[in-house]
């Protein structure tokens, strides 16, 4: 069971300092951006991290949304990352959800975050290069020191 708590506005970067944004095709991508680029591309660079109370404490449960014309929420349905046009619900009556991730700091590095899927144990949000694009994907990972599954989250509130 997940119950919605407060939300915060954040900029999410990979460890190469590329900024996560949602492109015109609703795809989550990473790109090099200056601070002014980041501001100019808002709201596509501003993510709403919705925190949830978890009936089984397993880290900070979050849903990640973005508000462009409408609110879209990050989902890992069938292990595929996409933004679905939906508001994060107030309550989720299950211990797993395709929109809930556990945000945890990397041990010894409070500023580096990992996001593990609540639906798929051992699967993490990751940045992966595909041709010329740096994509946000869901990846099964058993080397947890891999930088591709580490992110920084800068609060914009």
């Amino acid at each position: 069971y997940f119950g919605k708590l407060e939300s915060k506005l954040s900029i999410i970067r990979n460890l190469n300092d590329q900024v996560l944004f949602i492109d015109q095709g609703n795809r989550p991508l990473f790109e090099d951006m200056t601070d002014s680029d980041c501001r100019d591309n808002a709201p596509r660079t501003i993510f709403i991290i919705n925190m949830y109370k978890d009936s089984q404490p397993r880290g900070m449960a979050v849903a990640i949304s973005v508000k462009c014309e409408k609110i879209s929420t990050l989902s890992c349905e069938n292990r595929i990352i996409s933004f679905k046009e939906m508001n994060p619900p107030d309550n989720i009556k299950d211990t797993k959800s395709d929109i809930i991730f556990f945000q945890r700091s990397v041990p010894g590095h409070d500023n580096k975050m990992q996001f593990e899927s609540s639906s798929y144990e051992g699967y993490f949000l990751a940045c992966e290069k595909e041709r010329d694009l740096y994509k946000l994907i869901l990846k099964k990972k058993d080397e947890l020191g891999d930088r591709s599954i580490m992110f920084t989250v800068q609060n914009e509130d």
Epitope: G59, G108, E116, K140, G145
Partner: antibody, heavy 126, light 107 residues
């Protein structure tokens, strides 16, 4: 309690291949991997590689990648490690081990080699 | 590849002694470090994971500490059954690498 039971000792000639099996008995959760570790007589532990039973993907140590093949038969819960072009330096005890997520009090994951097979001695001698 | 430098390679101690074994990683391994005990002719046995978390059933005289690149295994008061070889393992990145081992012998 998970137990790993390995095949028996083998004596091989240089240039031959050996295939070691590792059978899981007992209840094991999903989301584990099989790793193989070897130990030459009087020496330390050396990681050889791993296989993911979910999709059969493998990761091999660079020094073995041209000679080792790790496979898994989900229907029998058995993992296999085949090493080819054997030489005398491959004389060692070969261990299989499971690689599973353990969690701390905040749910943070750590992968751990927890269950180990009893080891299989492979002797390479002409 | 991440190198794990374990020291000392051997140590002689008496029952009741406090013993410390260290492992130095060639880069940050984010506490993805486990410690194993191995006795002759036996498979390794997990003692500590996540640098400082005691595996169930392991006596509390064993403890682990460290972060970044420096890690320590401490046995607070040696018991006769603790004489064995100890290995650290980094699980941060492939290829996984073990320390060279520390043989703990009776003085």
């Amino acid at each position: 309690q998970v137990q790993l039971v390995q095949s028996g000792a083998e004596v091989k000639k240089p240039g031959a291949s050996v295939k070691v099996s590792c059978k899981v008995s007992g209840e094991i959760s999903t989301g584990y991997y099989f790793h193989w570790v070897r130990q030459a007589p009087g020496k330390g532990l050396e990681w050889m590689g791993r296989i993911d039973p979910e999709d059969d993907s493998t990761k091999y140590a660079e020094r073995f990648k041209d000679r080792v093949t790790m496979t898994e038969d989900t229907s029998t819960d058995t993992a296999y490690m085949e090493l080819s072009s054997l030489r005398s330096e491959d004389t060692a005890v070969y261990y299989c081990t499971t690689w599973r997520i353990y969690r701390d009090s905040s749910g943070r994951p750590f992968y751990v080699m927890d269950a180990w097979g009893q080891g299989t001695l492979v002797t390479v001698s002409s | 590849d991440i190198q794990m430098t374990q020291s000392p390679s051997s140590v002689s101690a008496s029952v009741g002694d406090r013993v410390t074994i260290t492992c130095l990683a060639s880069e940050d391994i984010y506490t993805y470090l486990t410690w194993y005990q191995q006795k002759p002719g036996k498979a390794p046995k997990l003692l500590i994971y996540g640098a400082n978390k005691l595996q169930d059933g392991v006596p509390s005289r064993f403890s682990g500490s460290g972060s970044g690149t420096d890690y320590t295994l401490t046995i607070s008061s040696l018991q006769p059954e603790d004489f064995a070889t100890y290995y650290c393992l980094q699980g941060s990145k492939f290829p996984l690498t073990f320390g060279q081992g520390t043989k703990l012998e009776i003085k």
